[in-house]
């Protein structure tokens, strides 16, 4: 807290300019009018104030706008944004994508701070949904942004926004998130032809059900092992050896290296050994010949 002292004669700021850098903290407090500061916020970021000086300027703005800053001020905060607390930001009403971009730019290259997370939350809630332009912006600054959302939050993403998603944006998504995103992606890309569709949908396949994997196996897609290993175990288990062979194409040989890992391990346990032998990969652990396989889940459903 800066003490209230009278501004020295001749030091009253008539505009926000570089001379203010050479003011002591108490002089900034005494000689800079908060209303002047608010109307000339666009100049503040062009002047290399120390963070200590920015604290004084923030204090002045806080006094002028106790209910929260107007967007005209927020848009030009620049480095002053780094001084804001999540509590400060919760008072804001940010509606312009340009304002969001300007503030994200200040934090560029750093992990998402609590301030940025709060800002994004306020912005998205204000818009009502994660539209394509917003998603484009957020994933450009924070590739992992999408995967930081809960399945409930992801449900507000319209299918049209899925076009903005890049494969790396989904790297840290868990199966619950992909379960929500996959149907949206399927809808978004439904009018694409086979090979183009597969390229686009591939990153989302961790949320795909068995029937969609069966359909893909009929399209010569040659899924790579990395994608296969991310598929839902419950979606892979019902696939036949022939279907997996068609799904993977030349990549089927990679199953051997993954035979101890899910979902390959669990899938092998569900296949007849003689079917596995047809692959010629030496996969072991299938159901021995002559054994009867009872699907107890089916039996329970019938009773």
């Amino acid at each position: 807290e800066v003490e209230k002292t009278a501004c020295p004669s001749g030091k009253k700021a008539r505009e926000i300019d570089e001379s203010l850098i050479f003011y002591k903290k108490w002089e900034l407090e005494a000689c800079v009018d908060a209303a002047l500061l608010a109307t000339q916020m666009d100049r503040v970021n062009a002047i290399p104030f120390t963070y200590e000086q920015l604290d004084v300027l923030k204090h002045k703005l806080d006094e002028l706008y106790p209910q929260g800053y107007p967007e005209s001020v927020i848009q030009h905060l620049g480095y002053l944004f780094l001084k804001m607390s999540p509590e400060d930001i919760r008072k804001w009403n940010v509606t312009s994508l340009e304002t969001l971009k300007a503030l994200l730019e200040v934090n560029k290259g750093h992990e998402m701070s609590p301030q940025v997370a709060t800002l994004i939350d306020r912005f998205v809630k204000g818009r009502g949904q994660l539209d394509k332009d917003t998603l484009d912006t957020l994933t450009a600054f924070y590739p992992g942004y999408l995967c930081s959302l809960s399945p409930e939050e992801l449900s507000s993403v319209p299918p049209s926004s899925i076009w903005a998603v890049r494969p790396q944006d989904l790297d840290t998504c868990d199966p619950r998130q992909l379960d929500v995103l996959y149907p949206k992606a399927r809808l978004a890309f439904q009018n694409m032809n086979g090979s183009e569709y597969f390229v686009k949908i591939q990153s989302f396949l961790g949320g795909a059900p068995t029937e969609d994997l069966k359909a893909l196996s009929q399209q010569n897609v040659s899924m790579d092992l990395a994608t296969f290993m991310k598929l839902r175990t419950d979606a892979v288990l019902p696939l036949t050896v022939a279907e997996v062979q068609k799904l993977l194409g030349p990549h089927v040989e990679g199953l051997k290296a993954e035979e101890r890992h899910r979902p390959v391990r669990d899938w092998i346990l569900r296949q007849r050994q003689d079917d596995l032998d047809t692959l010629g990969l030496g996969l072991q652990g299938g159901i021995p010949n002559g054994y009867l396989v009872l699907d107890l889940s089916m039996q329970e459903a019938l009773s």
């Epitope: 290399p48 120390t50 963070y51 200590e52 920015l54 480095y79 780094l82 001084k83 290259g109 750093h110």
Partner: nanobody
Framework: EVQLVESGGGLVQPGGSLRLSCAAS????????MYWVRQAPGKGLEWVSY???????NVADSVKGRFTISRDNSKNTLYLQMNSLRAEDTAVYYC???????????WGQGTLVTVSS
């Protein structure tokens, strides 16, 4: 974090010259602006000069025409060339930096400049 070490201070006669240096280490790639700040005995901090990462610089009116700031990014070093020194320039001179990663200013321990005959 950024560490700063000033050097070059000492006793000099009025009208004389000194060159202060400030060596930065640590996360120097995040440094945005570097400052010289001084504190005369019994007085508050006074900003003397600054230079930004883009090369923009300025000096306080009290030292204009006498002090020059410069920065060697390859050596992560800040300099203050002080000419025509006066008794009122006697102070501890601190180097300070603003980074793009932490909303705090980093400071050196200071170097004492005494102008006296």
């Amino acid at each position: 974090e950024v560490q700063l070490v000033e050097s070059g201070g000492g006793l000099v006669q009025p009208g004389g010259s000194l060159r202060l240096s400030c060596a930065a280490s640590g996360r120097t790639s995040t440094i945005d602006t570097m400052y010289w700040v001084r504190q005369a005995p019994g007085k508050g901090l006074e900003w003397v000069s600054y230079v930004t990462s883009r090369g923009t610089s300025n000096v306080a009116d009290s030292v204009k025409g006498r002090f020059t700031i410069s920065r060697d990014n390859s050596k992560n070093t800040l300099y203050l060339q002080m000419n025509s020194l006066r008794a009122e320039d006697t102070a501890v001179y601190y180097c300070s930096v603003r980074t793009t990663s932490y909303p705090v200013d980093f400071w050196g321990q200071g170097t004492l400049v005494t102008v006296s005959s």
